[in-house]
Amino acid sequence: IPVIEPSVPELVVKPGATVTLRCVGNGSVEWDGPPSPHWTLYSDGSSSILSTNNATFQNTGTYRCTEPGDPLGGSAAIHLYVKDPARPWNVLAQEVVVFEDQDALLPCLLTDPVLEAGVSLVRVRGRPLMRHTNYSFS
């Protein structure tokens, strides 16, 4: 099972920070994360490093490392917050298409974990949500 350094589940940094994420496995490893700018990838056998010297709010998200050759299929993850007061959200999509009566996933990431307690969902121009709409955040 691969291991990520730094060895924390969450990493909170300021915009412009240098961030280094290292994944080590027994065999070759691969990174999966939000499509975002400024990352440089260095791979060396069983180690892979994601690095940026100019983190932005767009780098906010969960970065997962997997070892394709691992029969157990284990993975490791770290969630990065780039805490930008001017950009509380990292919106990953401008439009989401769903079928009627099905669940909709709105991919919208907070850049600061402190804001999580005060999040609610409203429609544009403050109109109330449609009746029978249940929503939750993950």
């Epitope: 099972i1 350094e5 060895s7 924390v8 589940p9 969450e10 990493l11 940094v13 284990g74 993850a77």
Partner: antibody
Framework: EVKLEESGGGLVQPGGSMKLSCAAS????????MDWVRQSPEMGLEWVAE??????????FYAESVKGRFTISRDDSKSSVYLQMNSLRPEDTGIYYC?????????WGQGTTLTVSS | DIQMTQSPASLSVSVGETVTITCRAS??????LAWYQQKQGKSPQLLVH???NLADGVPSRFSGSGSGTQYSLKINSLQSEDFGSYYC?????????FGGGTKLEIK
């Protein structure tokens, strides 16, 4: 409010065993990484062991000084983490803290004292 | 294993002074450093994470800096409640070693 409460400390003879418990509340325990840290006047603060969340395969890690003697485990249904300590030595004496890892050791319990002495 | 060397071991200062505590890692820890404050008879409390980020509720007179192997914690205009012990700790893999601590005493 996050709360961590350790129990199970006491006096034990060298070579003996002891199990520490930590009861957690105020957060989603099953998502949390949990660690044990100990403190003594001789060694200062010393990281002991870690157990990660189910999403991280409940992976465990140990300090070299306790490897093979201590076992960290968790029961997500009881929001509790445990430290089974065997083959105890006098140098294992100290205050044992249960901690939650987020961006660092964000929350600490009040500690439970273990004394290993004959 | 990464070793953390903290200095000074103790410091005698007056209220209102500014102090700086330093921590050196034996190898690059890429800013993955935390600082803790511990008051007599109490559990440690997180002050700073990722080298420069203040934990929730920590007064702005505290600040962390550094990169690579060299890090510091600065306390401006010391208040009486700031006296106690301070520890650094790295999070670049395991084992997660702590510095030896700095005891801040009132002059």
């Amino acid at each position: 409010e996050v709360k961590l409460e350790e129990s199970g400390g006491g006096l034990v003879q060298p070579g003996g065993s002891m199990k520490l418990s930590c009861a957690a509340s105020g957060f989603t325990f099953s998502d949390a990484w949990m660690d044990w840290v100990r403190q003594s006047p001789e060694m200062g603060l010393e990281w002991v062991a870690e157990i990660r969340s189910k999403a991280n395969n409940h992976a465990t890690f140990y300090a070299e000084s306790v490897k093979g003697r201590f076992t960290i485990s968790r029961d997500d249904s009881k929001s509790s983490v445990y430290l089974q300590m065997n083959s105890l030595r006098p140098e294992d004496t100290g205050i044992y803290y249960c901690t939650r890892v987020k961006v660092g050791f964000d929350n600490w319990g009040q500690g439970t004292t273990l004394t290993v002495s004959s | 294993d990464i070793q953390m060397t903290q200095s000074p071991a103790s410091l005698s200062v007056s209220v209102g002074e500014t102090v700086t505590i330093t921590c050196r890692a034996s190898e690059n820890i890429y800013s993955n450093l935390a600082w803790y404050q511990q008051k007599q008879g109490k559990s440690p409390q997180l002050l700073v994470h990722a080298a420069t980020n203040l934990a929730d509720g920590v007064p702005s007179r505290f600040s962390g800096s550094g990169s690579g192997t060299q890090y510091s914690l600065k306390i401006n205009s010391l208040q009486s409640e700031d006296f106690g012990s301070y520890y650094c700790q790295h999070f670049w893999g395991t084992p997660r070693t702590f510095g030896g601590g700095t005891k801040l005493e009132i002059k």
